[in-house]
């Protein structure tokens, strides 16, 4: 094998999904022609054929159709291989075998890599933390390759090595998801950083969490509200649920209850010193006085308006206190769409018509969909506008421009995304010529 074949000594590093060039070259003698060349790329470990060139012709890829030579450069001795859309499974050694009169070969290593995502940090428990509590901090980073190195440190940069458990799991593509768990006893406050290092790319992804244990005053009364937003129809009454656990011997004289808007602290309703102080919110709120002593601090909001939408804080103070916020999501159903046609008479196949679908007084903003008689979505040439009235309710007008066939049905669907309510209208245009609406 007197032919000298040259490849890079260092591995070729390629990111997953990108293209990689495995360089290979030889020195052609004077008078060399491609008809003399036999070039074979194969996997070193298994001799599986990857790509070949013989008898003056590129024999093509034998490797998932993801390889290519550089045909214009072969005559100059460039036998490099292009590997497209690199996968983790491609990692390994590739042998470049060149035969002219004599022959030679050399192997080049492909090192595959994928950067790790910025770690996400979670805390358990994640509220009412006090100095001395033990917390579990989880650091998760995704879709990297090869396996990561994980380091933890405190706010001063001091490494934290005790009580760390790290697991790495490969997905179907061979990419790793890393989960590292640190158990730590809280001090007065502290910052905990997690660094996920890709050893091939020398890429560091890091995140940190600063834990400030609760201060005095502590707010030890547990106030419970629904996690999900309360959905209320415009004009109806809504109950914003809020409850606390009264201690034995509790009397309403001890209770301070304040409902306020979370974002502005505007007072909504209050109960102090055993007395309902009434509504401070357009006289549309009420408590449930008979239920207060059992810990039911819920608020009734009457004749809901769009402007009521938002977050309400329920603040309860007895000996100690606590608060929680509940979200009100306002909704109004859309009317059945009315359909109009322009022009609306003497229509013939090939005419362009404008179909307008109008639906009124809904909230929040609607999603509008058009489709033909076969249920095929119509997305081109659609213009939708939504305008809020004084009450904040939306009127929707959606315009479809369409070229008429021999006949056809056009449907418009107006969806309220909160109520998951669909209002639809359709128009069928048949025959020729015709008038719309059809004459009686």
């Amino acid at each position: 094998g007197a032919l000298e074949v040259q490849v890079p000594e260092d591995p070729v590093v390629a990111l997953v999904g990108t293209d990689a060039t495995l360089c290979c070259s030889f020195s052609p003698e004077p008078g060399f022609s491609l008809a003399q060349l036999n070039l074979i790329w194969q996997l070193t470990d298994t001799k599986q054929l990857v790509h070949s060139f013989a008898e003056g012709q590129d024999q093509g890829s034998a490797y998932a159709n993801r390889t290519a030579l550089f045909p214009d450069l072969l005559a100059q001795g460039n036998a490099s291989l292009r590997l497209q859309r690199v996968r983790v499974a491609d990692e390994g050694s590739f042998t470049c075998f060149v035969s002219i009169r004599d022959f030679g070969s050399a192997a080049v290593s492909l090192q595959v890599a994928a950067p790790y995502s910025k770690p996400s940090m979670t805390l358990e428990p994640n509220k009412d933390l006090r100095p001395g509590d033990t917390v579990t901090i989880t650091c998760s980073s995704y879709q990297g390759y090869p396996e990561a190195e994980v380091f933890w440190q405190d706010g001063q940069g001091v490494p934290l090595t005790g009580n760390v458990t790290t697991s790495q799991m490969a997905n179907e593509q061979g990419l790793f998801d890393v989960h590292s768990i640190l158990r730590v006893v809280l001090g007065a406050n502290g910052t905990y950083s997690c660094l996920v290092r890709n050893p091939v790319l020398q890429q560091d992804a890091h995140s940190s969490v600063t834990i400030t244990p609760q201060r005095s005053p502590t707010g030890a009364v547990e106030v419970q509200v629904p996690e999900d937003p309360v959905v209320a129809l415009v004009g109806t009454d809504a109950t914003l649920r809020c409850s606390f656990s009264p201690e034995p011997g509790f009397s309403l004289a001890q209770l301070n209850l304040i409902w306020q808007l979370t974002d502005t602290k505007q007072l909504v309703h209050s109960f102090t010193e055993g007395r309902d102080q009434g509504s401070a919110y357009a006289n549309r709120t009420a408590l449930f006085p008979d239920l207060l002593a059992q810990g039911n601090a819920s608020l009734r909001l009457q004749r809901v308006r769009v402007a009521d939408e938002g977050s309400f804080t329920c603040f309860v103070s007895i000996r100690d206190f606590g608060s929680a916020a509940v979200s009100l999501q306002v909704a109004a159903p859309y009317s059945k769409p009315s359909m109009t046609l322009e022009p609306n008479k003497d229509l013939r196949p090939g005419d362009t018509v404008t179909i307008t679908c109008s639906s009124y007084r809904g909230y929040p903003e609607a999603e509008v969909f058009w489709q033909d008689g076969q249920g095929v979505p119509l997305t081109g040439n659609v213009t939708t506008s939504q305008m809020a009235n004084e009450q904040g309710l939306f009127d929707v007008h959606s315009v479809l421009r369409v070229v008429l066939g021999a006949n056809g049905t056009y449907s418009c669907l107006v969806r309220n995304p909160v109520l998951q309510q669909d209002a639809h209208g359709s128009v069928t245009i048949t025959g020729q010529p015709m008038t719309f609406p059809p004459e009686a």
């Epitope: 400030t212 304040i258 102080q277």
Partner: antibody, heavy 118, light 110 residues
Framework: EVQLLESGGDLVQPGGSLRLSCAAS????????MNWVRQAPGKGLEWVAG????????YYADSVKGRFTISRDNSKNTLYLQMNSLRAEDTAVYYC???????????WGQGTTVTVSS | QSVLTQPPSASGTPGQTITISCSGS????????VNWYQQLPGTAPKLLIY???QRPSGVPDRFSGSKSGTSASLAISGLQSEDEADYYC???????????FGGGTKLTVL
């Protein structure tokens, strides 16, 4: 340790401007409403302005409305008070204080002195 | 002129009990909780009582607060020389959309 540290106080002429800063540490600044409170020499405490946790809602005392602007940069854990058209009666020690969910100002800075004089 | 009314001064001898009043209206004390602050000479105010009657950790139980209607009061029992300070009541006013303070009460321990 929970801390608020004011800076930016100075001697300024009537009609002049000044910007005060308050650096917060030791607590989750971006979840707290914040306030500026002042105290004129030998006088009582007077609330100046308040701002919500995201910075979108602000309240002002009538005496400073239209002249002072409260703002915050949560990425820097810093509260600001931009003071324009300053008057002699604005001379005071200015404190920043938190404003927690329970309508309590439980942490105060040490204050920075603003003197308005020609 | 402060929105909340406090006596400008109060005094007592060591061991005595004194009470400082704070009078407001239905838009502040009447529907909101009251906080009390102590300001020692040359220092920043410090939270003394919150939500009408609660003491932060570190505040001696000699200090107590209460509220009735549109008035609140701060009681200090077993008066000590280190209690000599200015005392302020404060709450949120829903009509003004503003924090309101009392004018402050200067406590002298004789």
């Amino acid at each position: 340790e929970v801390q608020l540290l004011e800076s930016g106080g100075d001697l300024v002429q009537p009609g002049g401007s000044l910007r005060l800063s308050c650096a917060a540490s030791g607590f989750t600044f971006n979840t707290y409403w914040m306030n500026w409170v002042r105290q004129a020499p030998g006088k009582g405490l007077e609330w100046v302005a308040g701002i919500n946790s995201k910075g979108g809602v602000t309240y002002y005392a009538d005496s400073v409305k239209g002249r002072f602007t409260i703002s915050r940069d949560n990425s820097k854990n810093t509260l600001y008070l931009q003071m324009n058209s300053l008057r002699a009666e604005d001379t005071a020690v200015y404190y920043c204080a938190d404003w927690n969910d329970y309508d309590i100002m439980d942490v105060w800075g040490q204050g920075t002195t603003v003197t308005v004089s020609s | 002129q402060s929105v909340l009314t406090q006596p400008p001064s109060a005094s007592g001898t060591p061991g005595q009990t004194i009470t400082i009043s704070c009078s407001g209206s239905s838009s502040n004390v009447g529907r909101r909780t009251v906080n009390w602050y102590q300001q020692l000479p040359g220092t920043a105010p410090k939270l003394l009582i919150y939500t009408n009657a609660q003491r932060p950790s570190g505040v001696p139980d000699r200090f107590s607060g209460s509220k009735s209607g549109t008035s609140a009061s701060l009681a200090i029992s077993g008066l000590q020389s280190e209690d000599e300070a200015d005392y302020y009541c404060a709450t949120w006013d829903d009509s003004l959309n503003a924090w309101v303070f009392g004018g402050g009460t200067k406590l002298t321990v004789l």
